[in-house]
Interface confidence: medium
C-alpha cells in the first residue's frame, strides 16, 4: 500500500491520543537501553510503511502483535485516514485468522514494539519539520 495520500495530521492526532498510551503500557517495565533501535524511516509514507510492517507482519519469534490493542487502533487509524487502505487489508486479515496463535509477550515482541515507538516518534518529528 502507498501511504502518500494519508491525512498525516489526523494520524498523528490518533497516535498521540490513544496509540501511544497502549504502546507505553505494553513496554512498561522495560528501558529503551534494553534494545537497539535498528529500524528507521526517512519520510512520512516510509514511516507508515515500516510501522505497518512491524505491527501486522508476523515474525518467527513474535507472531501475535496484530491482536494487541495498539495494533487494532493503528489499523483503525490507517483505515480511517488512508484512502483505500482497508480494502488492501481484507486478504491479509483473512490470512491472519487462519494463523491464530497463543498470545505470549516474548522479549522479541518487546524489542519489536520498542522499534515501533521509535518509528512513531520519527513519523511525528518528520511531520513537524514539514509544517
Amino acid at each position: 500500500y502507498d501511504f502518500t495520500n494519508c491525512d498525516f495530521q489526523k494520524i498523528e492526532a490518533d497516535y498521540l491520543r490513544t496509540i501511544s498510551k497502549d504502546l507505553i503500557t505494553y513496554m512498561s517495565g522495560t528501558k529503551s537501553t534494553d534494545f537497539n533501535n535498528t529500524v528507521s524511516c526517512s519520510n512520512r509514507p516510509h514511516c507508515l510503511t515500516e510501522i505497518q510492517s512491524l505491527t501486522f507482519n508476523p515474525t518467527p519469534r513474535c507472531a501475535s502483535l496484530a491482536k494487541e490493542m495498539f495494533a487494532r487502533k493503528t489499523k483503525a487509524t490507517l483505515a480511517l485516514w488512508c484512502p483505500g487502505y482497508s480494502e488492501t487489508q481484507i486478504n491479509a486479515t483473512q490470512a491472519m485468522k487462519k494463523r491464530r496463535k497463543r498470545k505470549v509477550t516474548t522479549n522479541k515482541c518487546l524489542e519489536q514494539v520498542s522499534q515501533l515507538l521509535g518509528l512513531w516518534r520519527r513519523f511525528i518529528r518528520t511531520l513537524l519539520k514539514k509544517q
Epitope: 498523528e12 492526532a13 498521540l16 491520543r17 490513544t18 501511544s20 498510551k21 507505553i24 503500557t25 513496554m27 512498561s28 517495565g29 522495560t30 528501558k31 529503551s32 520498542s114 515507538l117 516518534r121 511525528i124 518529528r125 513537524l128 519539520k129 509544517q131
Partner: nanobody, 127 residues
C-alpha cells in the same frame, strides 16, 4: 496500570505562585526518554499547550504567554514532572493536565486533541 496524576492546583491571587506536579505510575519517564508536557483548558476555551520537557536532553519549551513566568522540570528519581508557575494572571485560570509522548521541539508545544490520562488539577487566579 499506566497512569498520570496531577496535583498542586488551587486558588491564588494574581501575582502569586503555584507548583503543579505530575506523577507517573505503571511506567517510568526515563525509560523511553518520553517527552512530557502540561496542557490547560479554560472554561469554554480550547485546550492549549503550555510547556513541555524532553527527557532526551532536558530541553524545555513554553508557549509565548507563559515564557519567563513558568518553569518546567523533571525528577526522574521520583518519576514526576513539575510546573512552577510564578506571577500568575487571571487568564492562567484553567484545568491543567500533564501528558506524555507529546513530541515537543523547536516548533513549540504540540497542541493536540488527547484524552487526558489524569483528572487534571484546577488553577484559579483571582484578581
Amino acid at each position: 496500570e499506566v497512569q498520570l496524576v496531577e496535583s498542586g492546583g488551587g486558588l491564588v491571587q494574581a501575582g502569586g505562585s503555584l507548583r503543579l506536579s505530575c506523577a507517573a505510575s505503571g511506567f517510568t519517564f526515563a525509560d523511553y526518554d518520553y517527552d512530557i508536557g502540561w496542557f490547560r483548558q479554560a472554561p469554554g476555551k480550547e485546550r492549549e499547550g503550555v510547556s513541555c520537557i524532553s527527557n532526551r536532553d532536558g530541553s524545555t519549551y513554553y508557549t509565548d504567554s507563559v515564557k519567563g513566568r513558568f518553569t518546567i522540570s523533571s525528577d526522574n528519581a521520583k518519576n514526576t514532572v513539575s510546573l512552577q508557575m510564578n506571577s500568575l494572571k487571571p487568564e492562567d485560570t484553567a484545568v491543567y493536565y500533564c501528558a506524555v509522548e507529546i513530541h515537543c521541539d523547536d516548533y513549540g508545544v504540540e497542541n493536540f486533541d488527547f484524552d487526558p490520562w489524569g483528572q487534571g488539577t484546577l488553577v484559579t487566579v483571582s484578581s
